[in-house]
């Protein structure tokens, strides 16, 4: 299996009750606006074929996509949560900037691409869905990276 390096976050990042609560509140707010409950972005298909040691790298890719293609374009929505949560997630992304995989990561890119394609295909409702799954993103980052 490919070796991942620098793919670690300090657990203190996930032990801040205020920002954790705000992240979950943002996800809840967005999920209320999400009418497409049949489609899931972060779930078993995303992790399929990805070993536990590769998952932080996988979630880094998902985090970066979510920030750049979803949260930044939608930054005026779901206030006041968005203005607090986006900088928090951006800091996590920055801390994972040196997280890389040595070796073939095609299987990871394939899974991430499916998530990206789903969001793009759904358009704005895909972006809303991605925001509604920020609780899953948060939990997946925590479980994979600490």
């Amino acid at each position: 299996a490919p070796i991942s390096s620098h793919c670690r976050l300090d657990k203190s990042n996930f032990q801040q009750p205020y920002i954790t609560n705000r992240t979950f509140m943002l996800a809840k707010e967005a999920s209320l606006a999400d009418n497409n409950t049949d489609v899931r972005l972060i779930g078993e298909k995303l992790f399929h074929g990805v070993s536990m040691s590769e998952r932080c790298y996988l979630m880094k890719q998902v985090l970066n996509f979510t920030l750049e293609e979803v949260l930044f374009p939608q930054s005026d929505r779901f206030q006041p949560y968005m203005q607090e949560v986006v900088p928090f997630l951006a800091r996590l992304s920055n801390r994972l900037s040196t997280c890389h995989i040595e070796g073939d990561d095609l299987h990871i890119q394939r899974n991430v691409q499916k998530l990206k394609d789903t969001v793009k295909k759904l358009g704005e409702s895909g972006e809303i869905k991605a925001i509604g799954e920020l609780d899953l993103l948060f939990m997946s980052l925590r479980n994979a990276c600490i």
Epitope: N21, F24, A27, K28, S31, L32, T37, D38, R40, G43, E44, F47, S51, M52, S53, G132, E133, D135, L136, F138, M139, S140, N143, I146
Partner: antibody, heavy 119, light 108 residues
Framework: EVQLVQSGAEVKKPGASVKVSCQAS????????IHWVRQTPGQGFEWMGW????????RYAQKFQGWVTMTRDMSNTTAYMELPRLRDDDTAVYYC????????????WGQGTLVTVSS | QSVLTQPPSMSVAPGKTATITCGGN??????VHWYQQRPGQAPVLVIY???DRPSGIPERFSGSRSGNTATLTISRVEAGDEADFYC???????????FGGGTKLTVL
Amino acid sequence: EVQLVQSGAEVKKPGASVKVSCQASGYTFSDYYIHWVRQTPGQGFEWMGWVNPDTGGTRYAQKFQGWVTMTRDMSNTTAYMELPRLRDDDTAVYYCARDLTGYDYYDRWGQGTLVTVSS
Amino acid sequence: QSVLTQPPSMSVAPGKTATITCGGNNFRNKRVHWYQQRPGQAPVLVIYYDSDRPSGIPERFSGSRSGNTATLTISRVEAGDEADFYCQVWDFLADEAMFGGGTKLTVL
């Protein structure tokens, strides 16, 4: 075939400890979290926590924090759950179950281990 | 006391449809999973992510969710379906798995 095989039934006195094992086979042990869930007639199912077989990292339910210990042995693909200072109300069937994400569903369960606490 | 509310029991005649509900607060952004537990046996996953069916589970089993209620539907009920059925979600704020109290399905 994916299997989780647990150790046999235990009878313990109050104050004693118990260690239940869960041997996994038929899949890559390190790729799924192993959760422990207990079932009692009074309380129904109670989630106790999980162990990440890849790192040995754990997450415990608030009720069991500082009490339960979950470990794993990669060499024999076995997860363990230890409960010290048993009380009468710890009488339950203890299950291990596997989960891909750490926060989702359990697609395979062990057969269960009945732990009876009685003086 | 369970945070997820299920009817304790229900009876259904063979060939009919059984509908088991699971209610809870803020279900909107939670994923609901269902397990079947026959007497003396371990639970078996029958529905995950609200409505997905694992391989090996008959098509007669289906799941849905509307608002704060999730529903497990068993069509053309058979005698072998008699069991306890439990719903489960992950509560992200508590960071724990939560289970319903279970519904005992009796096939008449």
